[in-house]
Interface confidence: low
């Protein structure tokens, strides 16, 4: 059901700063289904699109998280984005019954980045160059600094990979592109392995 997570992230990433702020404010007051708690205000207001997607999925699971996102977007007048989510919901069969199933981390497994996680953690040495390529487009300032703060290359890569489960395909492609530019022979080696 990773499609719902990706769809939520895509929708939130396409909100401007103004819209994302409004989305959060509306999330604080929107009527919730019985049994569901509210994301704490303090934490919510600090989140970027990726963090917020994670929270929506962990608090409300993918099915209800998708539905809630659609509701808030419609309430903001962003029908077009809400309709895109509606399409995803219909295509993935995200029915309300799924809300009783525990949330699962369903990151794509076929991508180069997922397939070669261990090798990349062990063998990427120019981590700062990779970070600079991802800074702003894939990594938030906080995430960028958190990875930079680690001391060894391996720890930096482990920290970087801790953010990967919430990435969409475009983010993973960006990491692959950065690796191709900075460690072309490593990528070639892994692709042939």
């Amino acid at each position: 059901m990773g499609r719902a997570r990706d769809a939520i992230l895509d929708a939130l990433e396409n909100l401007s700063g103004d819209e994302l702020k409004k989305f959060k404010m509306k999330l604080l007051t929107v009527q919730l289904r019985e049994g569901y708690g509210r994301i704490p205000r303090g934490a919510l207001l600090q989140m970027d699109a990726i963090d917020l997607t994670d929270k929506l999925v962990s608090y409300y699971l993918e099915s209800y998280g998708l539905e809630l996102t659609m509701t808030v977007l419609r309430d903001m007048g962003l029908q077009e984005l809400a309709e895109q989510l509606q399409t995803t919901k219909e295509e993935s069969g995200a029915v309300a019954a799924a809300a009783s199933v525990p949330a699962q981390s369903t990151a794509r497994t076929g991508h180069f980045v997922d397939q070669h996680r261990q090798a990349l953690i062990a063998r990427v040495t120019e981590v700062d160059g990779v970070l600079d390529a991802l800074h702003g487009s894939v990594l938030t300032e906080g995430q960028y600094q958190a990875v930079r703060a680690e001391t060894t290359s391996q720890d930096k890569m482990r920290k970087l990979f801790s953010f990967v489960p919430s990435w969409n395909l475009t983010c993973k492609d960006s990491l692959l592109q950065a690796l191709k530019e900075i460690h072309p022979y490593l990528v070639m080696d892994l692709e042939q392995s």
């Epitope: 895509d10 990433e13 396409n14 909100l15 401007s16 700063g17 103004d18 702020k21 699109a49 309430d75 903001m76 007048g77 962003l78 029908q79 077009e80 984005l81 702003g136 487009s137 894939v138 475009t170 983010c171």
Partner: antibody, heavy 118, light 111 residues
Framework: EVQLQQSGAELVRPGSSVKMTCKTS????????MSWVKQRPGQGLEWIGY????????EYNEKFKGKATLTSDTSSSTVYMDFRSLTSEDSAIYFC???????????WGQGTTLTVSS | DIVLTQSPASLAVSLGQRATISCRAS??????????MHWYQQKPRQSPKLLIH???NLESGVPARFTGSGSGTDFTLNIHPVEEEDAATYYC?????????FGGGTKLEIK
Amino acid sequence: EVQLQQSGAELVRPGSSVKMTCKTSGYSFSSYGMSWVKQRPGQGLEWIGYIYVGNGYTEYNEKFKGKATLTSDTSSSTVYMDFRSLTSEDSAIYFCARLNRGRALDFWGQGTTLTVSS
Amino acid sequence: DIVLTQSPASLAVSLGQRATISCRASQSVSTSGHSYMHWYQQKPRQSPKLLIHFASNLESGVPARFTGSGSGTDFTLNIHPVEEEDAATYYCQHSWDLPYTFGGGTKLEIK
């Protein structure tokens, strides 16, 4: 064809109010927002605010809060801007413009010229 | 408020040459999905006309000689080859945060 037809020029006294209209046609009125923009003679553009006509949701530039009020009437596909406590600084051309998804202004009215003079 | 600084304030370009207009924002107006920067053309005694939305997406019916680029804080509108009918004032506008603001405008004159 999308069209935004604005009301005619206004000559009013300082301290008074005026209501400008923007009648729309050629698209689904409730699916879009409408913005208003001010342009003083020979000067640049200044965003006043917007209204989502589907649910009446409004946002204003702080500078125009208390000065402008945006409303809409779905039955006539018309958006209104009430402008009050007028001074000579309010003399300008006022445009209504449709908001697209990215909050760009993709269709504009022809403008209403407001002159505030005693 | 986000301040948009356009440069130059005016420029004169020969017919068929390239016109380049810059717009710098006081803070980033981009996500990984989009850049919330738009470009307009306004001719004397006319309403502004949207040329480009999301920094680089050409509006329907706008000639391909208009191109937009940039992300983050630095954006550019290029017109090439310039034609007589392009004489106008060009404005950038962001829709990143409230209030939305416009650049001061760049007046293009055709030599």
